[in-house]
């Protein structure tokens, strides 16, 4: 930590890496919930024009794709992987790519992904081949 930067009283935003350097936050697409035309594709772009600096350095990018009888939506946000999102743990938060995984939600089809590189939730990937065999 730079010596002139005060240590936080409320320490949750003074995040450092293993070498003691200040951890900078990443950039994520951040459009909250928007209607989407992404359907039956191996991958989709978010079509979100808003890129934000995540509020906290530990946050990662998240995308949530939902389809019900009426519409399809895509949600893009930053979120702390230590906390559940839509009641699910972000298991893939360390991934550089946003690989969609289906979650069980009654009354809708629900996919979610998380990732930890700048704007990685702009390109959401549904293709099964990425889930198993693709190392990057």
């Amino acid at each position: 930590i730079p010596p002139h930067v005060q240590k936080s009283v409320n320490n949750d935003m003074m995040v450092t890496d293993n070498n003691g350097a200040v951890k900078f936050p990443q950039l994520c697409k951040f459009c909250d919930v928007r209607f989407s035309t992404c359907d039956n594709q191996k991958s989709c772009l978010s079509n979100c024009s808003i890129t934000s600096i995540c509020e906290k350095p530990q946050e990662v990018c998240v995308a949530v794709w939902r389809k019900n009888d009426e519409n399809i939506t895509l949600e893009t946000v930053c979120h702390d992987p230590k906390l559940p999102y839509h009641d699910f743990i972000l298991e893939d938060a360390a991934s550089p790519k946003c690989i969609m995984k289906e979650k069980k939600k009654p009354g809708e089809t629900f996919f979610m992904c998380s990732c930890s590189s700048d704007e990685c939730n702009d390109n959401i990937i549904f293709s099964e081949e990425y889930n198993t065999s693709n190392p990057d």
Epitope: A21, V22, I53
Partner: nanobody
């Protein structure tokens, strides 16, 4: 030696404007990520804005979007933060920081200025 020196802070009324400057020396300006980061009294760091080079793409925290504008003048080796519609919650020490890639490891070397105090109060 890399040096970053902020200026332009001061006391301003709510709704007012300020422009912060960060004079850089000791490196080729305009080649790295530059940030404005602030720290309110007794709080942690808040990462306000980033400008990339090349290309000059700019990014903002949601809390300042539409009110703050980051820019750089490579000929003057200076980074700026134009702050409009200031609020009491913008009161903080504002630091400029430079992030320089450390080889191909994906890691960075960071350099920080000493900070300039912005107080928004009536």
């Amino acid at each position: 030696e890399v040096q970053l020196l902020e200026s332009g802070g001061g006391l301003v009324q709510p709704g007012g404007s300020l422009r912060l400057s960060c004079a850089a020396s000791g490196f080729t300006f305009g080649t790295d990520q530059m940030w404005w980061v602030r720290q309110a009294p007794g709080k942690g760091l808040e990462f306000v804005s980033r400008i990339d080079s090349p290309g000059g793409r700019t990014y903002y925290a949601n809390s300042v979007k539409g009110r703050f504008t980051i820019s750089r003048d490579n000929s003057k080796n200076t980074l700026y933060l134009q702050m409009n519609s200031l609020r009491a919650e913008d009161t903080a020490v504002y630091y400029c920081a430079k992030r320089q890639p450390a080889g191909v490891s994906g890691k960075y070397v960071d350099y920080w200025g000493q900070g300039t105090l912005v107080t928004v109060s009536s």
